[in-house]
Amino acid sequence: HNTTVFQGVAGQSLQVSCPYDSMKHWGRRKAWCRQLGEKGPCQRVVSTHNLWLLSFLRRWNGSTAITDDTLGGTLTITLRNLQPHDAGLYQCQSLHGSEADTLRKVLVEVLADPLDHRDAGDLWFPGESESFEDAHVEHSISRSLLEGEIPFPPTS
């Protein structure tokens, strides 16, 4: 799996989308998990409703929400009030029994808020030593811009 990069601004919301084949994954619940280390397990953060028919319901775990458009084949995860510690590797998963198929590998990057002039030294970016040659960047800054406000250019 290639890794898709989603960039969000600290303190704001980031929306991650994971497309999938709706027929192949028909009847399957979905989950969002955080990768613990390069070879470590993927720790479940939140999963869709226990009743697959109600997968459209937004389910929360803390500041993370998940909702699934089972007809359109799009899983959507919202990270509310994005913080530096939210940066890292995640997976969208399709569950079947005790197994889980990876729908998408996601790298979440947290960018400094351009309107916040505090020290941004604790913000996390993927280091040069980490190889994401196949990474595809999706700029997903979800804050609506105010009238006359200059959009902060995300770094890639």
Epitope: G27, H49, L54, L57, W60, T67
Partner: antibody, heavy 121, light 106 residues
Framework: QVQLVQSGAEVKKPGASVKVSCKAS????????MHWVRQAPGQGLEWMGI????????SYAQKFQGRVTMTRDTSTSTVYMELSSLRSEDTAVYYC??????????????WGKGTTVTVSS | DIQMTQSPSSLSASVGDRVTITCRAS??????LNWYQQKPGKAPKLLIY???SLQSGVPSRFSGSGSGTDFTLTISSLQPEDFATYYC????????FGGGTKVEIK
């Protein structure tokens, strides 16, 4: 107006099966899920399962898995709930209820009047 | 499954009283809670959905509040037609109802 009309009362022997119907009118049948909820005499409400009238997909409460079957007939806008291997504890009023939902809410807004099922030898 | 505990199981009140019924979930259910009213021999009727939204046609004396694990249904001024049994229902997980609270005439 939106209405759910259920079939009449049934008396069954232990081990038998019962099939209760619920006919919908006043709205687009395939646009709303349907639920079945039962209530034993003097007891609370117990959710049994859900059916999507559009595709026929179902989900059942674990307690009823293997004993309950929910089906629908789109030509008559009717859903059915069949419960097999009946026992005395299944004596209850069985309700169908329409489900309405969005990303942050879900509720049962219209209910049938209920069908009394009595299981007795 | 998530367990819903309602309290009290019954209460006696007079017309005009302010009545409060509580519902506690065995784990957090966000705001995914509904309240229903049921009168003897009748089907349940939706009062409040998503913890605090009043269903169309329901009198404004009914209100709901809470999130997480603790929820409250309040009737600000009890009317004769409000004597009934009230149920909470969670929908964060497989649907479960509370045991009910019977509101009787004092």
């Amino acid at each position: 107006q939106v209405q759910l009309v259920q079939s009449g009362a049934e008396v069954k022997k232990p081990g038998a099966s019962v099939k209760v119907s619920c006919k919908a009118s006043g709205y687009t049948f395939t646009s709303y899920y349907m639920h079945w909820v039962r209530q034993a005499p003097g007891q609370g409400l117990e959710w049994m399962g859900i059916i999507n009238p559009s595709g026929g997909s179902t989900s059942y409460a674990q307690k009823f898995q293997g004993r309950v079957t929910m089906t629908r007939d789109t030509s008559t806008s009717t859903v059915y709930m069949e419960l097999s291997s009946l026992r005395s504890e299944d004596t209850a009023v069985y309700y169908c209820a329409r489900g309405v939902g969005g990303q942050d809410y879900y509720y049962m807004d219209v209910w049938g009047k209920g069908t009394t099922v009595t299981v007795s030898s | 499954d998530i367990q819903m505990t309602q309290s009290p199981s019954s209460l006696s009140a007079s017309v005009g009283d302010r009545v409060t019924i509580t519902c506690r979930a065995s784990q957090s259910i966000s705001s995914y809670l509904n309240w229903y009213q049921q009168k003897p021999g009748k089907a349940p009727k939706l009062l409040i959905y998503a913890a605090s939204s009043l269903q169309s046609g329901v009198p404004s004396r009914f209100s709901g509040s809470g999130s997480g694990t603790d929820f409250t249904l309040t009737i600000s001024s009890l009317q004769p037609e409000d004597f009934a049994t009230y149920y909470c229902q969670q929908f964060d997980d497989v649907f479960t109802f509370g045991g009910g609270t019977k509101v009787e005439i004092k």
